[in-house]
């Protein structure tokens, strides 16, 4: 059964996955799409990683790790109800059915709205947790908290860059 | 527009440590998908890369270095260092800092001006 | 490591006149070439990335060709303002490496 995630609307949703390149310039083809994994590749396509590059991805969805050792672990910025669902992380490894594949599962909440509720957000146990901030106006800076794939806490800044929606494809 | 601006010291000591530091202006500092190096050029010579730090604290060094480089961040003030422990004369160069997308890995789009670092006693 | 060997060292033209500086690699980097022009006092400015994209801004007399161990960087009519060192990258092998670069003087 695929493991369970959980972000509040509003947040960021953290979904990791991991693997072990060779060396950062001898990476390993990442697919991650909505819906559970088929038989091959992903689908509903959200993000891909080729050898090198991060080569096609959608606004609101990018890597949070460092990908070049490895961390394909998926951001999904700002999320909303909709976003809830099955996922899957497939990590190409050539050959023929040698590829891993994970099925995680995000779960949406509502975002409670408290007359309690402080400038320090909601302390739920929703992961990453946000503390947002208003800066210059256009941009607001997050404190994204997650825990990688050691069970390590990491919190870290993030700027939350408003974007039009479109989608991104290099190459 | 990004704007990157090394700053340290000019004059290091031979066996002491090189440290320099990058500031980023203009945005993506902190917003996943960029990576931060380091790259030097020997006078006279060609850029060699030493190293880079992911915005997530992750880093990666040249092997011909890796022994005596750290690259750190600092993002409450947008700024990222590099280290060099036991420096030579042949540490002696231009060190830039400069930028790059995992859309284009080490394809760097942004650099500082450089700052100019002689190992002497 | 990939070796990157420029030619020739200096290159002596005049304004107006068609540039051709290359770039040879000790083994294939498929198309994962840039190249950069750097001025006196001056950081390296990307002017073509994966061989023969041009970055933004960068005028379209400047173009790149080539692929697997052979590459050129090509100036079509030079401007006074195109004499400088130019540098070759690539990013097909880890860690990256640059050529030596190939100075363009005035004649």
């Known amino acids: 059964s695929e493991v369970e995630y959980r972000a509040e609307v509003g947040q960021n949703a953290y979904l990791p996955c991991f693997y072990t390149p060779a060396a950062p310039g001898n990476l390993v083809p990442v697919c991650w799409g909505k819906g559970a994994c088929p038989v091959f590749e992903c689908g509903n396509v959200v993000l891909r990683t080729d050898e090198r590059d991060v080569n096609y991805w959608t606004s609101r969805y990018w890597l949070n790790g460092d990908f070049r050792k490895g961390d394909v672990s998926l951001t999904i910025e700002n999320v909303t109800l909709a976003d809830s669902g099955i996922y899957c992380c497939r990590i190409q490894i050539p050959g023929i059915m040698n590829d891993e594949k994970f099925n995680l599962k995000l779960v949406i909440k509502p975002a409670k709205v408290t007359p309690a509720q402080t400038a320090h957000g909601d302390s739920t146990t929703a992961s990453p947790r946000t503390l947002t901030t208003e800066r210059n106006g256009s941009e607001t800076q997050t404190l994204v908290t997650l825990h990688n794939n050691n069970g390590t806490k990491i919190s870290t800044w993030a700027d939350e860059i408003k974007d039009s929606g479109e989608t991104i494809r290099i190459g | 527009q990004v704007q990157l601006q090394e700053s340290g010291p000019g004059l290091v000591k031979p066996s002491e440590t090189l440290s320099l530091t990058c500031t980023v202006s203009?945005?993506?500092?902190?917003?996943?998908?960029?990576?931060w190096n380091w790259i030097r050029q020997p006078p006279g010579k060609g850029l060699e890369w030493i190293g880079y730090?992911?915005?997530?604290?992750?880093?990666n060094y040249n092997p011909s270095l890796k022994s005596r480089v750290t690259i750190s961040l600092d993002t409450s003030k947008n700024q990222f260092s590099l280290k060099l422990s036991s420096v030579t004369a042949a540490d002696t160069a231009v060190y830039y800092c400069?930028?790059?997308?995992?859309?284009?890995?080490?394809?760097?789009?942004?650099w500082g001006q450089g700052t100019l670092v002689t190992v002497s006693s | 490591e990939i070796v990157l060997t420029q030619s020739p060292a200096t290159l002596s033209l005049s304004p107006g006149e068609r540039a051709t500086l290359s770039c040879r690699a000790s083994?294939?980097?498929?198309?994962?070439l840039a190249w950069y022009q750097q001025k006196p006092g001056q950081a390296p400015r990307l002017l073509i990335y994966?061989?023969?994209n041009r970055a933004t801004g960068i005028p379209a007399r400047f173009s790149g060709s080539g692929s697997g161990t052979d590459f050129t960087l090509t100036i079509s009519s030079l401007e006074p303002e195109d004499f400088a060192v130019y540098y070759c990258?690539?990013?097909?092998?880890?860690?990256?490496?640059f050529g030596q670069g190939t100075k363009l003087e005035i004649k």
């Open positions: 400069a930028r790059d997308h995992y859309s284009s890995s080490w394809t760097f789009d942004y």
């Open positions: 203009g945005g993506s500092f902190s917003r996943g998908g960029y990576y």
């Open positions: 730090i992911y915005y997530s604290g992750s880093t």
């Open positions: 083994q294939s980097v498929s198309s994962y």
């Open positions: 994966d061989a023969s």
């Open positions: 990258q690539q990013r097909s092998n880890w860690p990256p490496t």
